[in-house]
């Protein structure tokens, strides 16, 4: 079958390949689309509702006057010439639809080197199909997961029109000493080939380096956060700083639905406790700073626990794996 | 066996104050922390705030900030919750309610509190 | 602020699978938002049931179970029983510290 794409919207004419150029003619369209069920059968006497959406013109090629995404699938014209000779003509109809030009929503105007930020969200209304929606820093594509970057997507489809609107949301960790000023981008790339990606007006937040401040010691007992089932682990966080921060505690890089609190206790352990902790201090006068992470586990009984582990930075380090 | 023990039904006068008290047995008091719920005539629940026995520190919903105030009485593993300048808006059953991480496990069976002249 | 939407009511038969569902109105539920259920028998009778989406409370029945279903957080009962007719509450939670509750979806077991 030859491959047609058409913009949604347009006129989309098929030849009918074999057909005389006038009538008579024998010959019939024969379409598997959203809009059928199974085969429909078009000929060049037309007639009743299929009229307004797809008609056989004297010429024997089928006319599409605007096309929608029902109108994908396969089209296929059999055709006798006046000698008896047949032709059949196949194509299979994919629509599109570019969307407008995607937008960055909700921008940071400032980012705080060395935590998450949220750069901010990007937009695409209108596609067909669905697309993807890219982050780049100065010009270079973002790859999530990576150093520190993080993306959340979310598709949804217009009831009425099959639309698509993306949206995905760009979370980065600034390097401390990094670029004052980065350059972020968002483009969208179609669906169907052959078609360049369109790309959002650049923002360029500011990033801003936190005074460095006495690091947030986390301290953890049991030393090396290994526990027997049931068992009580209580994690403290240290801050030498007046006043005092608040002090806000998060597992597997997620905050706890916990009030501040420098002392975290884990009592009566379970399957579901085991993981990543951290605090997070927050300073009226600086940014959050965040405690370098321990993990808490589970001994199994007969399981010989783990002598202190070791971790360094604010990084995701481990202790106690179990 | 573990249990949260709320005080009896209150009538009160509107713009007067009522202390309600949820006390904790079967288990650490300063080890969980406790949340407040308010649970409307014939409505949903609405999280009023949350308190951490152990250090006392507090997180409040907005729409709560200066109509109630959570604090604990460790020596009695007791949460207490006051409402002030009451009206008739704040007629409902209060409970207190068990969080360990993120999970509510244990309710207290209610406080029924009525604002009327 | 979050608006939390659970089904006004279901019904279900002695021993069949039901479940129900708690969507945001900010987007997909993820086991960020900690998912809780708790379920409500006449006189005030408040029983926790699930936390952190997925973690059965202490003495919950094996048959309760909760997870992530497309972008709504959702609380399975496998072999429903005649005592668990009741309401059932989600509340989620929001990480600028604020656990928002659904309005409760009232389950008949006929």
């Known amino acids: 079958a030859q491959n047609i794409t058409a913009r949604i919207g347009e006129p989309l004419v098929l030849k009918c390949k074999g057909a005389p150029k006038k009538p008579p003619q024998r010959l019939e369209w024969k379409l598997n689309t959203g809009r059928t069920e199974a085969w429909k059968v078009l000929s060049p006497q037309g007639g009743g509702p299929w009229d307004s959406v797809a008609r056989v013109l004297p010429n024997g090629s089928l006319f599409l006057p605007a096309v929608g995404i029902q109108d994908e699938g396969i089209f296929r014209c059999q055709a006798m010439n006046r000698n008896g000779k047949e032709t059949k003509s196949n194509y299979r109809v994919r629509v599109y639809q570019i969307p407008g030009k995607p937008e960055i929503v909700d921008s940071a105007s400032e980012l705080t080197a060395g935590v998450p930020n949220k750069v901010g969200t990007c937009v695409s209304e209108g596609s067909y199909p669905a697309g993807t929606l890219s982050w780049h820093l100065d010009g270079k594509p973002l790859v999530p997961n990576e150093k520190g970057v993080s993306v959340k997507e979310q598709t949804r489809r217009h009831p009425e029109t099959g639309l698509f609107t993306l949206q995905s949301e760009l979370m980065v960790t600034p390097a401390r000493g990094g670029d004052p000023r980065p350059t972020f981008s968002c483009s969208f790339s179609p669906g169907l080939p052959r078609h360049r990606a369109l790309r959002t007006a650049p923002i360029q937040p500011r990033v801003w380096e936190p005074v460095p401040l006495e690091e947030v010691q986390l301290v953890v007992e049991p030393e090396g956060g290994a526990v027997a089932p049931g068992g009580t682990v209580t994690l403290t966080c240290e801050v030498p700083a007046q006043p005092s921060p608040q002090i806000h505690w998060m597992k597997d890089g997620v905050p706890l639905p916990l009030p501040p609190s420098p002392v975290l206790i884990l009592p009566e352990i379970g399957p579901q406790d085991q993981g990543t902790y951290s605090c997070v201090a927050t300073h009226s006068s600086h940014g959050p700073q965040e405690s370098r992470a321990v993990s808490i586990s589970i001994i199994e009984p007969g399981e010989e626990g783990p002598t202190a582990g070791s971790v360094g930075g604010s990084g995701l380090g481990t202790l106690a794996l179990a | 066996e573990i249990q949260l023990q709320q005080t009896g039904p209150e009538l009160v006068k509107p713009g007067a104050s009522v202390k309600i008290s949820c006390k904790a047995s079967?288990?650490?008091?300063?080890?969980?922390?406790m949340v407040w719920v308010k649970q409307s005539h014939g409505k949903s629940l609405e999280w009023i705030g949350t308190?951490?026995?152990?250090?006392?520190?507090?997180s409040y919903n907005l729409k709560f900030k200066g109509k109630a105030t959570l604090t604990v009485d460790k020596s009695s593993s007791t949460a207490n919750m006051q409402l002030n300048s009451l009206t008739s808006e704040d007629s409902a059953v209060y409970y207190c309610a068990r969080l360990r991480l993120y999970a509510m496990d244990y309710w207290g069976q209610g406080t029924s509190v009525t604002v009327s002249s | 602020q979050a608006v939390v939407t659970q089904e006004s009511a279901l019904t279900t038969s002695p021993g069949e699978t039901v479940t129900l569902t708690c969507r945001s109105s900010t987007g997909a539920v993820t086991t960020s938002n900690y998912a809780n259920w708790v379920q409500e028998k006449p006189d005030h009778l408040f029983t926790g049931l699930i936390g952190?989406?997925?973690n059965r409370a202490p003495g919950v029945p094996a048959r309760f179970s909760g997870s992530l279903i497309g972008d709504k957080a959702a609380l399975t009962i496998t072999g429903a029983q005649t005592e668990d007719e009741a309401i059932y509450f989600c509340a989620l939670w929001y990480s600028n510290h604020f656990w928002v509750f659904g309005g409760g979806t009232k389950l008949t077991v006929l």
């Open positions: 308190i951490n026995p152990y250090y006392g520190s507090t």
């Open positions: 079967g288990y650490s008091f300063t080890d969980y922390i």
């Open positions: 952190g989406t997925n």
